[in-house]
């Protein structure tokens, strides 16, 4: 009878030990299985979870616009006063709803190439007005022409055309015209076949971004989604030195197993450069733990503050010999037009940039860019891309519309907030397929280990207690 009990206790302890060992073994083995599954599923090829979402994003992406309505156009043009602006918005469009096209796998170098079609659908219910709302903004063609043609002879010619077309420094345009294009009356007088349509995002609809060629991760998962080339080149030809490199992914996803210490590098064709984000905080997104990566102020710093940025300073006059910061001259990428990109309301920009503009209120929470990345898969499940489009306008002696200006202005035209968040359904699916399974496996591992250890300790204590009792 005593033997039976002792044997039972030993058996219980052994079972507990086995469970604990099994739980312990399941930890690295399970992690290995998870890693293997993740590695298999994040590869960009037909049949994987990643590929399906990559071809056509499951996230609804909105682009909100706020237009800077100029309140004192005549005063600025006549007296070179500070420009008083008032932001109006949001005006919301649905974007990135079109699937990638011309998808071609190259098994040789483990890449996949594609183009991303552009399209924008106005969402009246998410907007403060209609596409026909009017705004007073800088005259894009009048501001750009003397910048492109710095030749004094041609400026006299252009002045004749500007006067004839009754154009001036500022103009009134509808939202639709300003964003997507309008026939400019001054450019229409140029007697050569030039493009006379002007718009901040013209041309956009029915155009494509790319060709992108990215690594599919089949041979090396740590390279998945990283851009190998853009428009057939490994460099942009916009910047000197390493600033011209195409680094990282397109920010829609990153190689899996993201660590907080990692700097996420990505390329954005909107700003014609590669940039980076650093870990900010851990947040819970619809029950999924994600890492929030933010664009640091350092990325927009002057070469004085961040020497790595020296090659993004391509002109010395407007940048006050590269001491100004927070604005990026992307003219080389925009056919020589004087386009400057910044964060909204000149967030993280030097005081000299915003000084000539009244009515700006930079705010870190509203105006910063962030990416919420699920660390196991590397998928970006939520993001907010915020940027501002500005045009440089300079005094031009030969152009009457600009001759009274006493200083150059970097004039804010609009700022945008492009956001995407994983849908509730998709989030549930993601939890079930990824985080749920990992949680479940973790729970099973812990349960086995816990139950096993408890059983082993309890049965061993009971066995020892019995043994000492019997001994007495």
């Amino acid at each position: 009878m005593g033997c039976d009990r002792n044997c039972g206790l030993i058996a219980g302890a052994v079972i507990g030990a086995v469970l604990a060992v099994f739980g312990g073994i399941l930890m690295p083995v399970g992690d290995m299985l998870i890693e293997k599954t993740i590695k298999r599923e994040v590869v960009l090829e037909e049949g994987t979870t990643a590929f399906k979402n990559w071809v056509k994003t499951g996230t609804t992406v909105y682009r909100q616009f706020w237009i800077f309505d100029v309140q004192n156009p005549d005063d600025v043009a006549k007296n070179s006063s500070k420009i008083k602006v008032k932001q109006r918005g949001p005006y919301t469009y649905r974007v990135r709803y079109l699937a990638k096209e011309n998808i071609t796998q190259d098994p040789e170098d483990h890449t996949v190439s594609f183009v991303q079609p552009n399209g924008a659908i106005f969402e009246p219910s998410l907007s403060v007005g209609t596409e026909d709302d009017n705004f007073t903004v800088l005259n894009l063609a009048v501001a750009a022409a003397p910048h492109i043609y710095q030749n004094s002879f041609v400026q006299v010619v252009l002045n004749s055309l500007i006067k004839k077309s009754k154009s001036s420094m500022f103009q009134t345009r509808s939202l639709k015209e300003l964003l997507w294009g309008y026939k400019d009356p001054f450019l229409s007088l140029v007697p050569y076949p030039i493009s006379t349509t002007v718009g901040v995002f013209y041309p956009y609809n029915d155009t494509v971004d790319g060709v992108y060629k990215v690594f599919n991760g089949k041979d090396n998962i740590s390279k998945v989604a990283i851009i190998e080339s853009y428009k057939g080149k490994r460099n942009l030809s916009y910047w000197p030195s390493y600033c011209d490199m195409i680094n990282g992914t397109d920010a829609a996803s990153f190689p899996p197993f993201v660590e907080k210490s990692r700097t996420l590098r990505f390329f954005s064709s909107d700003i014609c450069r590669s940039i980076y984000a650093v870990f900010g905080s851990e947040i819970d997104l619809k029950g999924i733990p994600v890492y929030r990566f933010v664009l640091p102020a350092n990325a927009f710093a002057s070469p004085l503050q961040n020497p790595d940025n020296h090659c993004f300073c391509t002109e010395k006059v407007i940048s006050n010999n590269c001491t100004s910061y927070g604005v990026l001259d992307i003219g080389k990428c925009k056919e020589g037009k004087p386009v400057y990109i910044s964060l909204p309301h000149f967030l993280h920009a030097s005081p000299d940039v915003s000084e000539p503009i009244e009515g700006l209120h930079p705010n870190e929470d509203e105006h910063r860019t962030y990416l919420d990345v699920e660390p196991i898969t590397g998928f970006t499940l939520q993001f907010a891309k915020r940027l501002q489009v500005n045009i440089l306008v300079k005094p031009a002696r030969k152009i009457e519309a600009l001759k009274n200006l006493k200083r150059p202005y970097i004039v804010p035209i609009l700022w945008l907030n492009e956001t995407g968040t994983i849908g509730d359904e998709k989030a549930e699916m993601f939890k079930t397929q990824v985080t749920g399974k990992i949680k479940l496996l973790g729970m099973v591992e812990m349960a086995l280990l816990g139950i096993g250890v408890v059983m082993f300790v309890a049965f061993m204590i009971s066995y020892c207690a019995c043994k000492s009792k019997n001994g007495k």
């Epitope: 030749n151 002879f153 006299v156 010619v157 004749s160 007697p191």
Partner: antibody, heavy 117, light 107 residues
Framework: EVQLVESGGGLVQPGGSLRLSCAAS????????IHWVRQAPGKGLEWVAW????????YYADSVKGRFTISADTSKNTAYLQMNSLRAEDTAVYYC??????????WGQGTLVTVSS | DIQMTQSPSSLSASVGDRVTITCRAS??????VAWYQQKPGKAPKLLIS???SLYSGVPSRFSGSGSGTDFTLTISSLQPEDFATYYC?????????FGQGTKVEIK
């Protein structure tokens, strides 16, 4: 087809006046602007005057300022060069030429102006 | 005013030769330079604008180079019809100014 035809040249006495015409076809002169360029016998080319597109502005070489006037009649698609107080050194072949960005893509055949007593 | 100095003022060459004519501006004119060919008794003809841009219908043996203050017109292989006088012109600032010309003669 773009064509420019000058007329009005001839022999004139020093101190005299002459009006040169430049009839354009194949394009509208107001859209481009018209220049007058002259070439003294055996010498190089010298820019004389310019009327900017849409009659925007007129420009003259220092050597003719105050004596020559450039004008255009858009209804006739013709440019003119009114030359007063002519001097012997104004003797040259006068060409009218079309330009927008400052280079001359079309030229007339030229008309000879001789200033001599 | 911007002075345009052409050199040489004349040169003798044979058919098939490579000919180079230079032009120097008295100040920076960026790439706003044009080149013309003129034959006796005729109006000048545009060859090149913006220092390097070949005008339509002009044979590809003509090419232009340079930026800032120094410019060059090159005829890669001289043809019989190329014997003429060549002028450079700046179209950067009014008054527009020409070089004094380079006469290309048969050797």
């Amino acid at each position: 087809e773009v064509q420019l035809v000058e007329s009005g040249g001839g022999l004139v006495q020093p101190g005299g006046s002459l009006r040169l015409s430049c009839a354009a076809s194949g394009f509208t002169i107001s859209s481009f602007g018209i220049h007058w360029v002259r070439q003294a016998p055996g010498k190089g080319l010298e820019w004389v005057a310019w009327i900017a597109p849409y009659g925007g502005e007129e420009y003259y070489a220092d050597s003719v300022k105050g004596r020559f006037t450039i004008s255009a009649d858009t209804s006739k698609n013709t440019a003119y060069l009114q030359m007063n107080s002519l001097r012997a050194e104004d003797t040259a072949v006068y060409y009218c030429a079309r330009s927008f960005f400052g280079y001359f893509d079309y030229w007339g055949q030229g008309t000879l102006v001789t200033v001599s007593s | 005013d911007i002075q345009m100095t052409q050199s040489p003022s004349s040169l003798s060459a044979s058919v098939g030769d490579r000919v180079t004519i230079t032009c120097r501006a008295s100040q920076d004119v960026s790439n706003w330079v044009a080149w013309y060919q003129q034959k006796p008794g005729k109006a000048p003809k545009l060859l090149i604008s913006y220092a390097t841009s070949l005008y339509s219908g002009v044979p590809s043996r003509f090419s232009g180079s340079g930026s800032g203050t120094d410019f060059t017109l090159t005829i890669s292989s001289l043809q019989p019809e190329d014997f003429a006088t060549y002028y450079c012109q700046q179209h950067s600032n009014a008054p527009l100014t020409f070089g004094q010309g380079t006469k290309v003669e048969i050797k």
